[in-house]
Protein backbone atom coordinates (compact mmCIF):
# COMPACT_ATOMS: atom_id res chain seq x y z
CA UNK A 1 0.00 0.00 0.00
CA UNK A 2 1.14 3.56 -0.53
CA UNK A 3 2.72 4.09 2.84
CA UNK A 4 4.66 7.29 3.25
CA UNK A 5 6.57 5.82 6.16
CA UNK A 6 7.33 2.55 4.45
CA UNK A 7 9.09 3.34 1.18
CA UNK A 8 9.73 -0.29 0.17
CA UNK A 9 6.96 -0.27 -2.40
CA UNK A 10 5.58 -3.56 -3.65
CA UNK A 11 6.05 -2.92 -7.33
CA UNK A 12 6.81 -0.32 -9.94
CA UNK A 13 3.64 -1.11 -11.81
CA UNK A 14 -0.01 -0.67 -11.31
CA UNK A 15 -0.68 -3.70 -9.19
CA UNK A 16 -3.76 -3.52 -7.01
CA UNK A 17 -3.52 -5.18 -3.62
CA UNK A 18 -6.80 -6.32 -2.11
CA UNK A 19 -7.75 -4.30 0.95
CA UNK A 20 -11.10 -5.83 1.74
CA UNK A 21 -12.64 -9.03 0.57
CA UNK A 22 -15.91 -8.97 -1.35
CA UNK A 23 -18.81 -9.95 0.81
CA UNK A 24 -22.58 -9.99 0.71
CA UNK A 25 -24.45 -7.44 2.77
CA UNK A 26 -27.64 -8.20 4.67
CA UNK A 27 -29.62 -7.01 1.66
CA UNK A 28 -27.87 -9.54 -0.56
CA UNK A 29 -25.87 -6.93 -2.45
CA UNK A 30 -22.27 -7.91 -3.19
CA UNK A 31 -19.78 -5.19 -2.27
CA UNK A 32 -16.94 -4.79 -4.74
CA UNK A 33 -13.37 -5.60 -3.72
CA UNK A 34 -11.34 -2.48 -3.03
CA UNK A 35 -7.69 -2.01 -3.91
CA UNK A 36 -4.71 -0.07 -2.72
CA UNK A 37 -1.64 0.63 -4.87
CA UNK A 38 2.04 1.07 -4.11
CA UNK A 39 3.47 4.57 -3.93
CA UNK A 40 5.11 4.49 -7.36
CA UNK A 41 1.80 3.49 -8.93
CA UNK A 42 0.03 6.23 -7.01
CA UNK A 43 2.56 8.79 -8.20
CA UNK A 44 1.99 7.66 -11.82
CA UNK A 45 -1.79 7.84 -11.40
CA UNK A 46 -1.54 11.39 -10.04
CA UNK A 47 1.44 12.50 -12.15
CA UNK A 48 1.74 14.56 -15.32
CA UNK A 49 2.55 11.58 -17.56
CA UNK A 50 -0.98 10.20 -17.24
CA UNK A 51 -2.92 13.40 -16.53
CA UNK A 52 -1.25 15.76 -19.04
CA UNK A 53 0.86 13.90 -21.66
CA UNK A 54 -1.65 11.13 -22.43
CA UNK A 55 -4.67 13.42 -22.92
CA UNK A 56 -2.61 15.66 -25.23
CA UNK A 57 -1.60 12.72 -27.45
CA UNK A 58 -5.13 11.26 -27.40
CA UNK A 59 -6.60 14.64 -28.33
CA UNK A 60 -4.26 14.87 -31.33
CA UNK A 61 -5.17 11.31 -32.36
CA UNK A 62 -8.89 12.08 -32.03
CA UNK A 63 -8.74 15.41 -33.89
CA UNK A 64 -6.69 13.92 -36.76
CA UNK A 65 -7.95 10.33 -36.73
CA UNK A 66 -11.71 10.88 -36.62
CA UNK A 67 -12.15 13.12 -39.71
CA UNK A 68 -9.43 11.43 -41.81
CA UNK A 69 -10.64 7.88 -41.15
CA UNK A 70 -14.26 9.01 -41.41
CA UNK A 71 -13.58 10.52 -44.80
CA UNK A 72 -11.60 7.43 -45.86
CA UNK A 73 -14.44 5.10 -44.95
CA UNK A 74 -16.92 7.32 -46.82
CA UNK A 75 -14.64 7.41 -49.89
CA UNK A 76 -14.07 3.65 -49.89
CA UNK A 77 -17.74 2.81 -49.40
CA UNK A 78 -19.49 5.46 -51.51
CA UNK A 79 -16.95 7.11 -53.79
CA UNK A 80 -14.94 4.15 -55.03
CA UNK A 81 -16.64 2.33 -57.87
CA UNK A 82 -14.39 -0.71 -58.08
CA UNK A 83 -14.09 -2.45 -54.71
CA UNK A 84 -10.61 -3.89 -55.18
CA UNK A 85 -9.17 -6.01 -52.32
CA UNK A 86 -6.94 -3.08 -51.32
CA UNK A 87 -10.03 -0.88 -50.97
CA UNK A 88 -11.78 -3.54 -48.86
CA UNK A 89 -8.78 -3.87 -46.51
CA UNK A 90 -8.42 -0.10 -46.21
CA UNK A 91 -12.13 0.31 -45.52
CA UNK A 92 -11.78 -2.22 -42.69
CA UNK A 93 -8.66 -0.45 -41.45
CA UNK A 94 -10.54 2.86 -41.39
CA UNK A 95 -13.49 1.21 -39.61
CA UNK A 96 -11.18 -0.29 -36.96
CA UNK A 97 -9.61 3.14 -36.40
CA UNK A 98 -13.02 4.80 -36.13
CA UNK A 99 -14.32 2.22 -33.66
CA UNK A 100 -11.33 2.96 -31.44
CA UNK A 101 -11.15 6.73 -31.91
CA UNK A 102 -14.85 7.43 -31.21
CA UNK A 103 -14.28 6.47 -27.56
CA UNK A 104 -11.32 8.81 -27.14
CA UNK A 105 -13.29 11.73 -25.64
CA UNK A 106 -14.10 9.43 -22.69
CA UNK A 107 -10.46 8.37 -22.49
CA UNK A 108 -9.28 11.99 -22.61
CA UNK A 109 -11.76 13.02 -19.88
CA UNK A 110 -10.68 10.01 -17.79
CA UNK A 111 -7.01 11.05 -17.82
CA UNK A 112 -7.67 14.79 -17.42
CA UNK A 113 -9.77 14.07 -14.31
CA UNK A 114 -6.88 12.29 -12.62
CA UNK A 115 -7.52 8.80 -14.06
CA UNK A 116 -11.01 8.75 -12.60
CA UNK A 117 -13.51 6.64 -14.57
CA UNK A 118 -17.11 7.76 -14.03
CA UNK A 119 -18.77 6.09 -17.01
CA UNK A 120 -19.38 2.62 -15.61
CA UNK A 121 -17.86 -0.84 -15.89
CA UNK A 122 -19.35 -1.72 -19.31
CA UNK A 123 -18.03 1.38 -21.12
CA UNK A 124 -14.57 0.83 -19.62
CA UNK A 125 -14.51 -2.74 -20.97
CA UNK A 126 -15.67 -1.54 -24.40
CA UNK A 127 -13.00 1.17 -24.47
CA UNK A 128 -10.21 -1.26 -23.53
CA UNK A 129 -11.46 -4.00 -25.86
CA UNK A 130 -11.63 -1.55 -28.77
CA UNK A 131 -8.26 -0.02 -27.84
CA UNK A 132 -6.39 -3.33 -28.14
CA UNK A 133 -8.73 -4.61 -30.83
CA UNK A 134 -7.84 -1.64 -33.02
CA UNK A 135 -4.12 -2.25 -32.64
CA UNK A 136 -4.36 -5.92 -33.61
CA UNK A 137 -6.92 -5.25 -36.34
CA UNK A 138 -4.59 -2.63 -37.81
CA UNK A 139 -1.67 -5.07 -37.80
CA UNK A 140 -3.70 -7.77 -39.54
CA UNK A 141 -5.36 -5.52 -42.13
CA UNK A 142 -2.00 -3.85 -42.80
CA UNK A 143 -0.54 -7.31 -43.37
CA UNK A 144 -3.36 -8.18 -45.78
CA UNK A 145 -2.86 -4.89 -47.62
CA UNK A 146 0.91 -5.42 -47.85
CA UNK A 147 0.58 -8.97 -49.14
CA UNK A 148 -2.11 -7.82 -51.58
CA UNK A 149 0.08 -4.97 -52.89
CA UNK A 150 2.86 -7.47 -53.55
CA UNK A 151 0.39 -9.88 -55.18
CA UNK A 152 -0.81 -7.13 -57.55
CA UNK A 153 2.76 -6.53 -58.72
CA UNK A 154 3.46 -10.26 -59.20
CA UNK A 155 0.07 -11.13 -60.67
CA UNK A 156 -1.53 -7.98 -62.16
CA UNK A 157 -4.27 -9.89 -64.00
CA UNK A 158 -6.92 -11.80 -62.10
CA UNK A 159 -10.63 -12.12 -61.60
CA UNK A 160 -11.57 -8.93 -59.74
CA UNK A 161 -14.92 -10.16 -58.36
CA UNK A 162 -13.34 -13.34 -56.99
CA UNK A 163 -10.50 -11.36 -55.42
CA UNK A 164 -12.97 -8.97 -53.80
CA UNK A 165 -14.98 -11.85 -52.34
CA UNK A 166 -11.80 -13.42 -50.94
CA UNK A 167 -10.85 -10.04 -49.39
CA UNK A 168 -14.32 -9.73 -47.80
CA UNK A 169 -14.00 -13.28 -46.41
CA UNK A 170 -10.53 -12.57 -45.00
CA UNK A 171 -11.79 -9.30 -43.47
CA UNK A 172 -14.71 -11.05 -41.75
CA UNK A 173 -12.32 -13.73 -40.46
CA UNK A 174 -10.04 -11.02 -39.02
CA UNK A 175 -12.94 -9.30 -37.24
CA UNK A 176 -14.04 -12.64 -35.80
CA UNK A 177 -10.48 -13.49 -34.69
CA UNK A 178 -10.04 -10.09 -33.01
CA UNK A 179 -13.41 -10.45 -31.29
CA UNK A 180 -12.32 -13.83 -29.94
CA UNK A 181 -8.85 -12.76 -28.79
CA UNK A 182 -10.18 -9.64 -27.04
CA UNK A 183 -12.89 -11.55 -25.12
CA UNK A 184 -10.66 -11.70 -21.99
CA UNK A 185 -10.51 -7.89 -21.99
CA UNK A 186 -14.32 -7.70 -21.94
CA UNK A 187 -14.67 -10.42 -19.28
CA UNK A 188 -12.04 -9.23 -16.77
CA UNK A 189 -13.16 -6.52 -14.32
CA UNK A 190 -11.36 -3.41 -15.53
CA UNK A 191 -12.63 -0.76 -13.09
CA UNK A 192 -11.05 -0.61 -9.64
CA UNK A 193 -11.89 1.90 -6.90
CA UNK A 194 -8.88 3.26 -4.99
CA UNK A 195 -10.09 5.06 -1.86
CA UNK A 196 -6.71 6.64 -1.08
CA UNK A 197 -6.83 8.57 -4.35
CA UNK A 198 -10.63 8.78 -4.51
CA UNK A 199 -10.54 7.52 -8.09
CA UNK A 200 -11.97 4.59 -10.02
CA UNK A 201 -9.37 3.46 -12.54
CA UNK A 202 -10.12 1.86 -15.89
CA UNK A 203 -7.55 -0.84 -16.81
CA UNK A 204 -4.69 1.08 -15.13
CA UNK A 205 -4.95 -0.98 -11.95
CA UNK A 206 -5.59 -4.69 -12.12
CA UNK A 207 -5.68 -7.31 -9.34
CA UNK A 208 -2.17 -8.55 -8.52
CA UNK A 209 -3.07 -12.22 -8.91
CA UNK A 210 -4.53 -11.57 -12.36
CA UNK A 211 -1.58 -9.45 -13.48
CA UNK A 212 1.15 -11.87 -12.57
CA UNK A 213 0.24 -14.93 -14.61
CA UNK A 214 -2.69 -14.35 -16.91
CA UNK A 215 -1.75 -10.97 -18.35
CA UNK A 216 1.79 -12.07 -19.27
CA UNK A 217 0.55 -15.25 -20.97
CA UNK A 218 -2.23 -13.33 -22.75
CA UNK A 219 -0.06 -10.55 -24.17
CA UNK A 220 2.79 -12.93 -25.02
CA UNK A 221 0.36 -15.03 -27.08
CA UNK A 222 -0.94 -11.93 -28.84
CA UNK A 223 2.57 -10.60 -29.48
CA UNK A 224 3.60 -13.87 -31.15
CA UNK A 225 0.38 -14.69 -32.99
CA UNK A 226 -1.04 -11.30 -33.89
CA UNK A 227 2.12 -9.20 -34.06
CA UNK A 228 5.30 -11.16 -34.87
CA UNK A 229 3.83 -13.51 -37.47
CA UNK A 230 1.96 -10.73 -39.37
CA UNK A 231 5.03 -8.47 -39.05
CA UNK A 232 7.14 -11.19 -40.68
CA UNK A 233 4.59 -11.51 -43.52
CA UNK A 234 4.48 -7.73 -44.01
CA UNK A 235 8.28 -7.44 -44.05
CA UNK A 236 8.56 -10.33 -46.51
CA UNK A 237 5.95 -8.78 -48.81
CA UNK A 238 7.77 -5.45 -48.89
CA UNK A 239 11.23 -6.98 -49.37
CA UNK A 240 9.90 -8.96 -52.35
CA UNK A 241 8.05 -5.90 -53.62
CA UNK A 242 11.23 -3.79 -53.55
CA UNK A 243 13.07 -6.53 -55.44
CA UNK A 244 10.33 -6.69 -58.07
CA UNK A 245 10.23 -2.90 -58.50
CA UNK A 246 14.01 -2.73 -58.83
CA UNK A 247 14.13 -5.32 -61.57
CA UNK A 248 11.15 -3.97 -63.56
CA UNK A 249 11.53 -1.64 -66.56
CA UNK A 250 11.13 2.05 -65.77
CA UNK A 251 8.87 4.33 -67.72
CA UNK A 252 7.43 7.56 -66.28
CA UNK A 253 4.29 5.84 -64.98
CA UNK A 254 6.25 2.99 -63.41
CA UNK A 255 8.56 5.51 -61.71
CA UNK A 256 5.54 7.24 -60.16
CA UNK A 257 4.21 3.91 -58.93
CA UNK A 258 7.63 2.95 -57.58
CA UNK A 259 7.93 6.21 -55.63
CA UNK A 260 4.45 5.75 -54.23
CA UNK A 261 5.27 2.15 -53.27
CA UNK A 262 8.42 3.32 -51.48
CA UNK A 263 6.42 5.99 -49.62
CA UNK A 264 3.91 3.31 -48.61
CA UNK A 265 6.71 1.03 -47.36
CA UNK A 266 8.26 3.88 -45.36
CA UNK A 267 4.84 4.73 -43.84
CA UNK A 268 4.17 1.12 -42.82
CA UNK A 269 7.71 0.81 -41.45
CA UNK A 270 7.17 4.00 -39.43
CA UNK A 271 3.92 2.57 -38.11
CA UNK A 272 5.66 -0.59 -36.97
CA UNK A 273 8.54 1.34 -35.40
CA UNK A 274 6.35 3.91 -33.64
CA UNK A 275 3.10 2.08 -32.92
CA UNK A 276 3.25 -1.69 -33.02
CA UNK A 277 6.76 -2.82 -32.04
CA UNK A 278 7.25 -0.70 -28.88
CA UNK A 279 3.77 -1.45 -27.52
CA UNK A 280 3.89 -5.20 -28.13
CA UNK A 281 7.46 -5.47 -26.87
CA UNK A 282 6.76 -3.45 -23.72
CA UNK A 283 3.46 -5.22 -23.01
CA UNK A 284 5.40 -8.48 -22.81
CA UNK A 285 8.44 -7.03 -20.97
CA UNK A 286 6.25 -5.11 -18.49
CA UNK A 287 4.18 -8.15 -17.50
CA UNK A 288 7.24 -10.42 -17.54
CA UNK A 289 9.01 -8.13 -15.05
CA UNK A 290 5.96 -8.13 -12.79
CA UNK A 291 5.73 -11.91 -13.04
CA UNK A 292 9.42 -12.55 -12.37
CA UNK A 293 10.43 -9.65 -10.08
CA UNK A 294 7.13 -8.41 -8.69
CA UNK A 295 7.79 -4.98 -10.17
CA UNK A 296 8.17 -3.37 -13.59
CA UNK A 297 10.93 -0.80 -14.04
CA UNK A 298 9.68 0.00 -17.54
CA UNK A 299 6.22 1.19 -16.47
CA UNK A 300 6.67 4.76 -17.78
CA UNK A 301 7.97 3.42 -21.12
CA UNK A 302 5.07 0.96 -21.26
CA UNK A 303 2.57 3.83 -20.74
CA UNK A 304 4.23 5.91 -23.49
CA UNK A 305 4.40 2.94 -25.88
CA UNK A 306 0.70 2.14 -25.45
CA UNK A 307 -0.10 5.79 -25.96
CA UNK A 308 2.01 5.97 -29.14
CA UNK A 309 0.31 2.83 -30.46
CA UNK A 310 -2.84 4.92 -30.94
CA UNK A 311 -0.97 7.09 -33.45
CA UNK A 312 -1.63 4.35 -35.98
CA UNK A 313 -5.07 5.97 -36.42
CA UNK A 314 -3.25 9.09 -37.65
CA UNK A 315 -0.72 7.23 -39.81
CA UNK A 316 -3.26 4.96 -41.56
CA UNK A 317 -4.65 7.85 -43.68
CA UNK A 318 -1.17 8.20 -45.22
CA UNK A 319 -1.41 4.55 -46.26
CA UNK A 320 -4.78 5.25 -47.89
CA UNK A 321 -3.21 8.27 -49.60
CA UNK A 322 -0.40 6.24 -51.18
CA UNK A 323 -2.65 3.33 -52.19
CA UNK A 324 -6.01 4.84 -53.19
CA UNK A 325 -6.39 7.31 -56.05
CA UNK A 326 -9.92 8.18 -54.90
CA UNK A 327 -8.81 8.92 -51.34
CA UNK A 328 -5.92 10.98 -52.70
CA UNK A 329 -8.34 13.15 -54.69
CA UNK A 330 -10.77 13.63 -51.82
CA UNK A 331 -7.97 14.31 -49.31
CA UNK A 332 -6.42 16.97 -51.56
CA UNK A 333 -9.74 18.65 -52.13
CA UNK A 334 -10.76 18.46 -48.48
CA UNK A 335 -7.50 20.18 -47.54
CA UNK A 336 -8.18 22.81 -50.19
CA UNK A 337 -11.76 23.11 -48.87
CA UNK A 338 -13.57 22.19 -52.07
CA UNK A 339 -15.41 19.15 -53.28
CA UNK A 340 -14.27 16.80 -56.03
CA UNK A 341 -17.49 17.65 -57.92
CA UNK A 342 -16.65 21.38 -57.76
CA UNK A 343 -13.14 20.71 -59.07
CA UNK A 344 -14.52 18.58 -61.90
CA UNK A 345 -17.09 21.25 -62.67
CA UNK A 346 -14.36 23.89 -62.82
CA UNK A 347 -12.21 21.74 -65.08
CA UNK A 348 -15.12 20.92 -67.35
CA UNK A 349 -16.09 24.59 -67.48
CA UNK A 350 -12.56 25.64 -68.41
CA UNK A 351 -12.33 22.95 -71.07
CA UNK A 352 -15.69 23.88 -72.57
CA UNK A 353 -14.78 27.56 -72.69
CA UNK A 354 -11.56 26.69 -74.46
CA UNK A 355 -13.33 24.66 -77.17
CA UNK A 356 -16.49 26.68 -77.71
CA UNK A 357 -18.22 29.48 -75.85
CA UNK A 358 -21.57 28.31 -77.18
CA UNK A 359 -21.15 24.68 -76.23
CA UNK A 360 -23.10 23.42 -73.25
CA UNK A 361 -22.65 19.72 -73.76
CA UNK A 362 -20.36 19.18 -70.77
CA UNK A 363 -22.02 18.02 -67.60
CA UNK A 364 -21.02 18.92 -64.08
CA UNK A 365 -21.49 15.35 -63.06
CA UNK A 366 -18.81 14.12 -65.42
CA UNK A 367 -16.77 11.40 -63.80
CA UNK A 368 -14.20 10.99 -66.51
CA UNK A 369 -12.20 14.10 -65.70
CA UNK A 370 -9.39 13.38 -63.23
CA UNK A 371 -8.11 15.97 -60.82
CA UNK A 372 -4.46 16.94 -61.05
CA UNK A 373 -2.50 19.51 -59.13
Amino acid sequence: TIQGTNRSSKGRSLIGKVDGTSHVTGKGVTVETVFSVDEFSASVLTGKLTTVFLPIVYTIVFVVGLPSNGMALWVFLFRTKKKHPAVIYMANLALADLLSVIWFPLKIAYHIHGNNWIYGEALCNVLIGFFYGNMYCSILFMTCLSVQRYWVIVNPMGHSRKKANIAIGISLAIWLLILLVTIPLYVVKQTIFIPALNITTCHDVLPEQLLVGDMFNYFLSLAIGVFLFPAFLTASAYVLMIRMLRSSAMDENSEKKRKRAIKLIVTVLAMYLICFTPSNLLLVVHYFLIKSQGQSHVYALYIVALCLSTLNSCIDPFVYYFVSHDFRDHAKNALLCRSVRTVKQMQVSLTSKKHSRKSSSYSSSSTTVKTSY
Partner: antibody
Protein backbone atom coordinates in the same frame (compact mmCIF):
# COMPACT_ATOMS: atom_id res chain seq x y z
CA UNK B 1 10.17 15.13 12.49
CA UNK B 2 6.83 16.11 10.90
CA UNK B 3 5.59 19.47 12.14
CA UNK B 4 2.38 21.32 11.25
CA UNK B 5 1.84 24.81 12.66
CA UNK B 6 -1.53 26.52 12.15
CA UNK B 7 -2.20 30.25 12.40
CA UNK B 8 -4.80 32.83 11.43
CA UNK B 9 -7.56 31.92 13.87
CA UNK B 10 -9.40 34.48 15.96
CA UNK B 11 -12.71 36.23 16.59
CA UNK B 12 -14.77 37.05 13.52
CA UNK B 13 -18.31 38.29 12.94
CA UNK B 14 -20.89 36.13 11.11
CA UNK B 15 -20.79 36.67 7.35
CA UNK B 16 -17.17 37.80 7.41
CA UNK B 17 -14.06 36.02 6.11
CA UNK B 18 -10.92 34.53 7.63
CA UNK B 19 -7.86 32.82 6.17
CA UNK B 20 -6.04 30.08 8.04
CA UNK B 21 -2.47 29.04 7.27
CA UNK B 22 -0.50 25.93 8.07
CA UNK B 23 3.28 25.81 7.68
CA UNK B 24 4.65 22.29 7.22
CA UNK B 25 8.16 21.05 7.90
CA UNK B 26 10.06 17.78 8.34
CA UNK B 27 8.82 16.13 5.14
CA UNK B 28 8.58 16.66 1.36
CA UNK B 29 5.42 18.75 1.33
CA UNK B 30 4.62 18.38 -2.38
CA UNK B 31 4.37 14.58 -2.09
CA UNK B 32 1.46 14.57 0.32
CA UNK B 33 -2.25 15.26 0.31
CA UNK B 34 -3.25 17.70 3.05
CA UNK B 35 -6.51 18.23 4.93
CA UNK B 36 -8.29 20.49 7.39
CA UNK B 37 -10.37 19.00 10.21
CA UNK B 38 -12.34 20.96 12.77
CA UNK B 39 -13.72 20.35 16.23
CA UNK B 40 -16.43 22.54 17.76
CA UNK B 41 -15.97 23.14 21.53
CA UNK B 42 -16.98 19.97 23.43
CA UNK B 43 -18.00 18.25 20.18
CA UNK B 44 -16.65 15.61 17.82
CA UNK B 45 -14.35 15.79 14.80
CA UNK B 46 -15.51 16.97 11.36
CA UNK B 47 -13.54 16.77 8.13
CA UNK B 48 -13.53 20.13 6.33
CA UNK B 49 -11.39 19.86 3.18
CA UNK B 50 -8.67 17.89 1.42
CA UNK B 51 -6.27 18.79 -1.39
CA UNK B 52 -4.05 16.55 -3.52
CA UNK B 53 -0.27 16.92 -3.55
CA UNK B 54 -0.35 18.97 -6.77
CA UNK B 55 -3.48 20.91 -5.82
CA UNK B 56 -5.19 19.48 -8.89
CA UNK B 57 -8.13 17.93 -7.05
CA UNK B 58 -10.00 19.27 -4.03
CA UNK B 59 -12.70 17.73 -1.83
CA UNK B 60 -15.21 19.36 0.54
CA UNK B 61 -18.22 18.20 2.54
CA UNK B 62 -21.55 19.83 1.63
CA UNK B 63 -21.51 21.86 4.85
CA UNK B 64 -18.65 24.10 3.62
CA UNK B 65 -18.84 23.72 -0.17
CA UNK B 66 -18.99 27.09 -1.88
CA UNK B 67 -17.88 28.97 1.24
CA UNK B 68 -14.49 27.47 2.07
CA UNK B 69 -11.48 27.15 -0.26
CA UNK B 70 -8.48 24.96 0.45
CA UNK B 71 -5.25 25.78 -1.39
CA UNK B 72 -1.54 25.16 -1.07
CA UNK B 73 1.78 26.76 -1.96
CA UNK B 74 4.25 23.94 -2.46
CA UNK B 75 7.18 26.37 -2.82
CA UNK B 76 6.38 27.82 0.62
CA UNK B 77 5.35 24.47 2.22
CA UNK B 78 2.10 26.13 3.25
CA UNK B 79 -1.51 24.99 3.31
CA UNK B 80 -4.37 27.51 3.40
CA UNK B 81 -8.06 27.56 4.23
CA UNK B 82 -10.00 30.59 3.03
CA UNK B 83 -13.29 30.78 4.95
CA UNK B 84 -16.00 33.10 3.61
CA UNK B 85 -19.55 33.81 4.79
CA UNK B 86 -18.75 32.43 8.24
CA UNK B 87 -21.59 31.13 10.39
CA UNK B 88 -21.84 30.50 14.12
CA UNK B 89 -21.66 26.72 13.47
CA UNK B 90 -18.19 27.21 11.89
CA UNK B 91 -16.76 28.14 15.30
CA UNK B 92 -14.23 25.44 16.14
CA UNK B 93 -10.59 24.53 16.54
CA UNK B 94 -9.22 23.94 13.03
CA UNK B 95 -6.51 21.31 12.62
CA UNK B 96 -4.15 20.99 9.69
CA UNK B 97 -3.42 17.31 8.98
CA UNK B 98 -1.22 15.14 6.81
CA UNK B 99 -1.78 11.53 5.87
CA UNK B 100 0.73 8.73 6.34
CA UNK B 101 0.12 7.88 2.69
CA UNK B 102 2.39 9.06 -0.09
CA UNK B 103 0.32 10.52 -2.98
CA UNK B 104 -3.03 9.70 -1.42
CA UNK B 105 -5.22 10.01 1.66
CA UNK B 106 -7.34 7.71 3.81
CA UNK B 107 -6.66 8.84 7.36
CA UNK B 108 -4.98 11.64 9.25
CA UNK B 109 -1.68 10.65 10.84
CA UNK B 110 -0.07 13.96 11.64
CA UNK B 111 -1.97 16.83 13.23
CA UNK B 112 -1.09 20.40 14.05
CA UNK B 113 -1.84 21.92 17.45
CA UNK B 114 -4.95 23.63 16.04
CA UNK B 115 -6.08 27.23 15.72
CA UNK B 116 -9.30 28.45 17.32
CA UNK B 117 -11.89 30.26 15.21
CA UNK B 118 -14.67 32.05 17.09
CA UNK B 119 -17.66 33.32 15.14
CA UNK B 120 -19.69 35.79 17.14
CA UNK B 121 -21.35 39.18 16.73
CA UNK C 1 -22.55 10.12 3.03
CA UNK C 2 -21.35 7.22 5.17
CA UNK C 3 -22.60 7.58 8.77
CA UNK C 4 -20.35 6.30 11.54
CA UNK C 5 -22.08 5.30 14.79
CA UNK C 6 -19.96 4.70 17.87
CA UNK C 7 -20.98 2.89 21.04
CA UNK C 8 -20.97 3.28 23.94
CA UNK C 9 -21.00 7.05 24.33
CA UNK C 10 -18.83 6.72 27.44
CA UNK C 11 -17.41 4.00 29.65
CA UNK C 12 -15.16 3.62 32.65
CA UNK C 13 -12.72 0.82 33.37
CA UNK C 14 -10.42 -0.23 36.17
CA UNK C 15 -6.66 -0.61 35.82
CA UNK C 16 -5.79 -3.87 34.03
CA UNK C 17 -9.31 -4.34 32.69
CA UNK C 18 -10.14 -4.99 28.99
CA UNK C 19 -12.52 -2.67 27.19
CA UNK C 20 -14.13 -2.65 23.76
CA UNK C 21 -15.51 0.20 21.66
CA UNK C 22 -17.75 -0.50 18.68
CA UNK C 23 -18.10 1.41 15.42
CA UNK C 24 -20.85 0.78 12.90
CA UNK C 25 -20.73 2.15 9.35
CA UNK C 26 -23.92 2.82 7.39
CA UNK C 27 -22.43 0.89 4.46
CA UNK C 28 -19.53 -1.50 3.88
CA UNK C 29 -16.19 0.30 4.04
CA UNK C 30 -13.86 -2.60 3.15
CA UNK C 31 -11.65 -2.25 6.26
CA UNK C 32 -10.97 1.43 5.52
CA UNK C 33 -11.31 2.36 9.17
CA UNK C 34 -9.05 4.28 11.54
CA UNK C 35 -9.15 4.82 15.31
CA UNK C 36 -7.93 8.00 17.04
CA UNK C 37 -7.36 8.91 20.67
CA UNK C 38 -7.74 12.49 21.90
CA UNK C 39 -6.64 13.64 25.33
CA UNK C 40 -8.07 16.85 26.86
CA UNK C 41 -6.58 19.99 25.29
CA UNK C 42 -4.54 17.94 22.79
CA UNK C 43 -4.77 17.07 19.10
CA UNK C 44 -6.11 13.64 18.16
CA UNK C 45 -3.56 10.86 17.63
CA UNK C 46 -3.88 8.04 15.09
CA UNK C 47 -3.79 4.61 16.76
CA UNK C 48 -5.02 2.14 14.15
CA UNK C 49 -5.60 2.25 10.38
CA UNK C 50 -6.93 -0.31 7.88
CA UNK C 51 -9.11 -1.54 10.76
CA UNK C 52 -6.30 -3.53 12.40
CA UNK C 53 -2.87 -2.08 11.49
CA UNK C 54 -1.18 -0.58 14.52
CA UNK C 55 0.61 2.75 14.06
CA UNK C 56 4.29 2.76 15.05
CA UNK C 57 4.74 3.58 18.73
CA UNK C 58 1.24 2.50 19.76
CA UNK C 59 1.30 -0.21 22.48
CA UNK C 60 0.29 -3.71 21.37
CA UNK C 61 -2.36 -3.75 24.15
CA UNK C 62 -4.47 -1.82 21.68
CA UNK C 63 -5.93 -3.76 18.76
CA UNK C 64 -8.54 -3.29 16.06
CA UNK C 65 -10.75 -5.77 14.25
CA UNK C 66 -13.85 -6.05 12.11
CA UNK C 67 -14.97 -6.10 8.50
CA UNK C 68 -17.81 -4.91 6.29
CA UNK C 69 -19.79 -2.45 8.39
CA UNK C 70 -18.83 -3.52 11.93
CA UNK C 71 -15.53 -2.67 13.58
CA UNK C 72 -14.19 -2.63 17.13
CA UNK C 73 -11.29 -1.30 19.15
CA UNK C 74 -10.03 -3.40 22.06
CA UNK C 75 -7.84 -2.08 24.88
CA UNK C 76 -6.39 -4.83 27.06
CA UNK C 77 -4.81 -4.15 30.46
CA UNK C 78 -6.25 -0.63 30.91
CA UNK C 79 -3.63 1.98 31.86
CA UNK C 80 -3.97 5.65 33.03
CA UNK C 81 -2.61 6.90 29.66
CA UNK C 82 -5.52 5.19 27.90
CA UNK C 83 -7.95 7.77 29.24
CA UNK C 84 -9.41 10.06 26.61
CA UNK C 85 -11.96 10.25 23.83
CA UNK C 86 -11.76 7.64 21.04
CA UNK C 87 -13.01 8.31 17.52
CA UNK C 88 -13.45 6.00 14.54
CA UNK C 89 -13.18 7.35 10.97
CA UNK C 90 -13.92 5.84 7.58
CA UNK C 91 -11.36 6.44 4.84
CA UNK C 92 -13.31 4.69 2.12
CA UNK C 93 -15.34 7.45 0.50
CA UNK C 94 -15.58 11.22 0.52
CA UNK C 95 -16.74 12.96 2.57
CA UNK C 96 -14.52 11.41 5.23
CA UNK C 97 -16.65 10.93 8.33
CA UNK C 98 -15.98 10.36 12.04
CA UNK C 99 -17.91 8.60 14.75
CA UNK C 100 -19.38 10.71 17.55
CA UNK C 101 -16.66 9.63 20.00
CA UNK C 102 -16.43 7.39 23.07
CA UNK C 103 -15.14 8.82 26.33
CA UNK C 104 -13.00 6.31 28.26
CA UNK C 105 -12.31 7.06 31.91
CA UNK C 106 -10.34 5.27 34.60
CA UNK C 107 -12.47 4.07 37.51
Amino acid sequence: EVQLVESGGGLVQPGRSLKLSCVASGFTFNNYWMSWIRQAPGKGLEWVASITNTGGRIFYPDSVKGRFTISRDNAQNTLYLQMNSLRSEDAATYYCTRDRLYYGSNWFTYWGQGTLVTVSS
Amino acid sequence: DIQMTQSPHSLSASLGETVSIECLASEAISNYLAWYQQKPGKSPQLLIYYASSLKDGVPSRISGSGSGTQYSLKISNMQPEDEGVYYCQQGYKYPRTFGGGTKLELK
